[in-house]
């Protein structure tokens, strides 16, 4: 079936870009000017998900690539990564668990949990150049918040 | 004051274009999703289509071919382009701010123009 | 395409009177569903989203239920201001967003 999908780009609270670091990393740094045209664009795809209240389920690909944002257990540890898909049969309205987010808007601000693992979420560092990840707190150093950006073509 | 304000409505002729405006203030399009929703006289609500960023539009299958939703950021304007205009496309056009990002419904609507098809 | 049906088309009741308006969807559509009540003139107004949760603003009187394909939206004690058509809306049901055909609230 058919899925409604969006192009977009998204920065952490303390506004950060999202930019790739190798073919399968994305890391969350400051860009400005001519720079912020290196940010990562997604095609974010509305999925079919659990039954909710207020948390809408999305799929995160990067935009004209074959790459969707996953979450699988790695040294038993919940952990994102970027994973190559098949072109011709994505995005679809029931992708697998491991790429669904339930993406949660309190105040203009966006987060993003793991279907497959709940109460995780796409987190970036306080710091700079570091790269994206799936962490396990809320509201700590780390940072779950982030804002969206519609891409115009 | 958060609001919606359509214009741009009146009186066409059959096999005609009109173009709505919908002009958003005390928020920005620029992450807001909006959609075009129609109301012939008398009858009941019926979904045109939205617009997400300017690549990402979506129709009712009967609006598909003749209708065009876009977008001017700059202005925070959203437009409903229409053409080959029938007498049935007579309604009251309302556009309204899709709630979330996918949430499909909506929470802050226009006040509505109306669009009559005659000769 | 996901077809709303509502039941009843018009419905004639009393202040202080219960009632409850059902919505069927052709086909499952999970808790995606919402409810609004428009007024003669005005644009609609978003009582209920997600089957159950009341929108902003929206007194407690108004309650919505249902999952998969059937749905309600019951006013426990009806109000002089709650004279209106209310319509359900499909929400998520792949690409369209469809609206039921409404059900007119009149004085008895």
């Known amino acids: 079936a058919p899925v409604r999908s969006l192009n977009c780009t998204l920065r952490d609270s303390q506004q950060k870009s999202l930019v790739m670091s190798g073919p399968y990393e994305l890391k969350a740094l400051h860009l400005q000017g001519q720079d912020m045209e290196q940010q990562v664009v997604f095609s974010m795809s509305f999925v079919q998900g659990e039954e909710s209240n207020d948390k809408i389920p999305v799929a995160l690909g990067l935009k004209e690539k074959n790459l969707y944002l996953s979450c699988v257990l790695k040294d038993d540890k919940p952990t994102l990564q970027l994973e190559s898909v098949d072109p011709k049969n994505y995005p679809k309205k029931k992708m697998e668990k491991r790429f669904v987010f339930n993406k949660i808007e309190i105040n203009n601000k966006l987060e993003f949990e793991s279907a497959q693992f709940p109460n995780w979420y796409i987190s970036t560092s306080q710091a700079e150049n570091m790269p994206v990840f799936l962490g396990g707190t809320k509201g700590g150093q780390d940072i779950t918040d982030f804002t969206m950006q519609f891409v115009s073509s | 004051e958060v609001q919606l304000v359509e214009s741009g409505g009146g009186l066409v002729q059959p096999g005609g274009s009109l173009r709505l405006s919908c002009t958003a203030s005390?928020?920005?399009?620029?992450?807001?999703?909006m959609a075009w929703v129609r109301q012939a006289p008398g009858k009941g609500l019926e979904w045109v289509g939205i617009?997400?960023?300017?690549?990402?539009?979506y129709y009712a299958s009967w609006a598909k071919g003749r209708f065009t939703i876009s977008r001017d950021t700059s202005k925070n304007t959203v437009y409903l382009q229409m053409n080959s205009l029938r007498a049935e496309d007579t309604a009251v056009y309302y556009c309204?701010?899709?709630?979330?990002?996918?949430?499909?419904?909506?929470?802050?609507w226009g006040q509505g123009t109306l669009v009559t098809v005659s000769s | 395409e996901i077809v709303m049906t509502q039941s009843p088309s018009t419905l004639s009741a009393s202040v202080g009177d219960r009632v409850i308006i059902t919505c069927q969807a052709s086909?499952?559509?999970?808790?995606?569903l919402s409810w609004y009540q428009q007024k003669p003139g005005k644009a609609p107004k978003l009582l209920i989203y997600?089957?159950?949760t009341l929108a902003s603003g929206v007194p407690s009187r108004f309650s919505g239920s249902g999952s998969g394909a059937e749905f309600t939206l019951t006013i426990s004690s009806l109000q002089p201001d709650d004279f209106a058509t209310y319509y359900c809306?499909?929400?998520?049901?792949?690409?369209?967003?469809?609206f039921g055909q409404g059900t007119k609230l009149t004085v008895k």
């Open positions: 617009i997400y960023d300017s690549a990402s539009t």
């Open positions: 086909q499952s559509i999970d808790n995606w």
């Open positions: 005390g928020f920005s399009l620029s992450d807001a999703a």
């Open positions: 809306q499909n929400t998520g049901g792949g690409i369209n967003i469809a």
């Open positions: 309204a701010r899709e709630r979330q990002i996918f949430s499909g419904d909506f929470v802050l």
């Open positions: 997600r089957a159950s």
